[in-house]
């Protein structure tokens, strides 16, 4: 039961995380730009990975996409790539994990296959979460190092006027959404990997040796019972008619230690 719960919870947490990564990638509020002493009028700027927006004090809002690729910083392109890779891996992970869920029966899929799929999806979620966290962190670092506080001194020729304008860049809501979503996806992935260990089959069959007596004896193998709940196909004592001591290696199946679930 614990395995199913861990797997299910991991799936849900990852699902929420990936939804958050998608939301963060699409959001416009990755950074905001404020002028400390704006000499013109109250205008608020905020930027995302794909477009820049302006909101006026009147409530008017307008967004404009970054139509050029060449003029964009390499760091921004890297952040875009990381977020997209995170989304793609997460989406594939979700698809794989749906089929891996223990509570869903698909044909005669064995536990070993489900365990492998759970591990695969778990690793995908972990990488997806790391991509999102890395992308958001790279963007945050870019803001701090390159843009955080840019000061411009304005000189005019005739009047001899000097004005200093400071542009302050602050972290937008999308950064926090991205960090939290990446963390959730990562946690969900770890939970899936933990669940995988519980799903993995273990060899619990005991090798039995049969001895033949004189004549046309029939050797019973008391050790030939499968160490399981009795739901397997090899639950009866098998008779060996050909004589000679041998081990029972025929018709082996690999039951899960969690067949009780």
């Amino acid at each position: 039961m614990a395995v199913t719960a861990c797997q299910g919870l991991g799936f849900v947490v990852s699902l929420i995380g990936i939804a958050g990564i998608i939301a963060a990638t699409c959001m416009d509020q990755w950074s905001t730009q404020d002028l400390y002493n704006n000499p013109v009028t109250a205008v608020f700027n905020y930027q995302g990975l794909w477009r820049s927006c302006v909101r006026e004090s009147s409530g008017f809002t307008e967004c404009r996409g970054y139509f050029t690729l060449l003029g964009l910083p390499a760091m921004l392109q890297a952040v875009r790539a990381l977020m997209i890779v995170g989304i793609v891996l997460g989406a594939i992970g979700l698809l794989v994990s749906i089929f891996a869920l223990k509570c869903i029966r698909i044909g005669s899929m064995e536990d070993s296959a489900k365990a492998n799929m759970t591990l695969t999806s778990g690793i995908m979620f972990i990488v997806s979460g790391l991509c999102a966290i890395a992308g958001v962190s790279v963007f945050a670092n870019m803001l701090v190092t390159n843009f955080w506080m840019s000061t411009a001194n304005m000189y005019t020729g005739m009047g001899g006027m000097v004005q200093t304008v400071q542009t302050r860049y602050t972290f937008g809501a999308a950064l926090f959404v991205g960090w939290v979503a990446g963390g959730l996806t990562l946690i969900g992935g770890v939970m899936m990997c933990i669940a995988c260990r519980g799903l993995a089959p273990e060899e619990t069959n005991y090798k039995a040796v049969s001895y033949h007596a004189s004549g046309h004896s029939v050797a019973y193998k008391p050790g030939g019972f499968k160490a399981s709940t009795g739901f397997g196909s090899n639950t009866k004592n098998k008779k060996i008619y050909d004589g000679g001591a041998r081990t029972e290696d025929e018709v082996q199946s690999y039951p899960s230690k969690h067949d009780y679930v």
Epitope: T41, S52, P73
Partner: nanobody, 122 residues
């Protein structure tokens, strides 16, 4: 590099009219707002009028309300100031000011023109 080029200044009689223009050029991503400031001889800088480029919200100094009209042409990145009923106290150097987003991944900054002289005298 961004440039603001003003034009339209000159000598005019009291009660007359002038139209100032300010053209913004360079690697402009978008214009937040633009405005006109003036500096009379021996005085400080004062805001004359300002306009946001998106919504077109305007702001005027009390001394010019009803006489001056600010407007913009978004397609040309140009700012205008129509000055009517000019007075002697309007004599000053008029500076164009622009709050711009510049570059591919735009950075916000404020730019100033070199100024154009308006003299109101009989």
């Amino acid at each position: 590099q961004v440039q603001l080029v003003e034009s339209g200044g000159g000598l005019v009689q009291p009660g007359g009219s002038l139209r100032l223009s300010c053209a913004a050029s360079g690697s402009i991503f978008s214009i937040n707002a633009m405005g006109w400031y003036r500096q009379a001889p021996g005085k400080g800088l004062e805001l004359v009028a300002a306009i946001t480029f998106g919504g077109g919200s305007t702001n005027y100094a009390d001394s010019v309300k009803g006489r001056f009209t600010i407007s913009r042409d978004n397609s040309k990145n140009t700012l205008y100031l129509q000055m009517n009923s000019l007075r002697a106290e309007d004599t000053a150097v008029y500076y164009c000011n622009a709050d711009l987003l510049v570059g591919g991944f735009p950075r916000r900054n404020v730019y100033w023109g070199q100024g154009t002289l308006v003299t109101v005298s009989s």
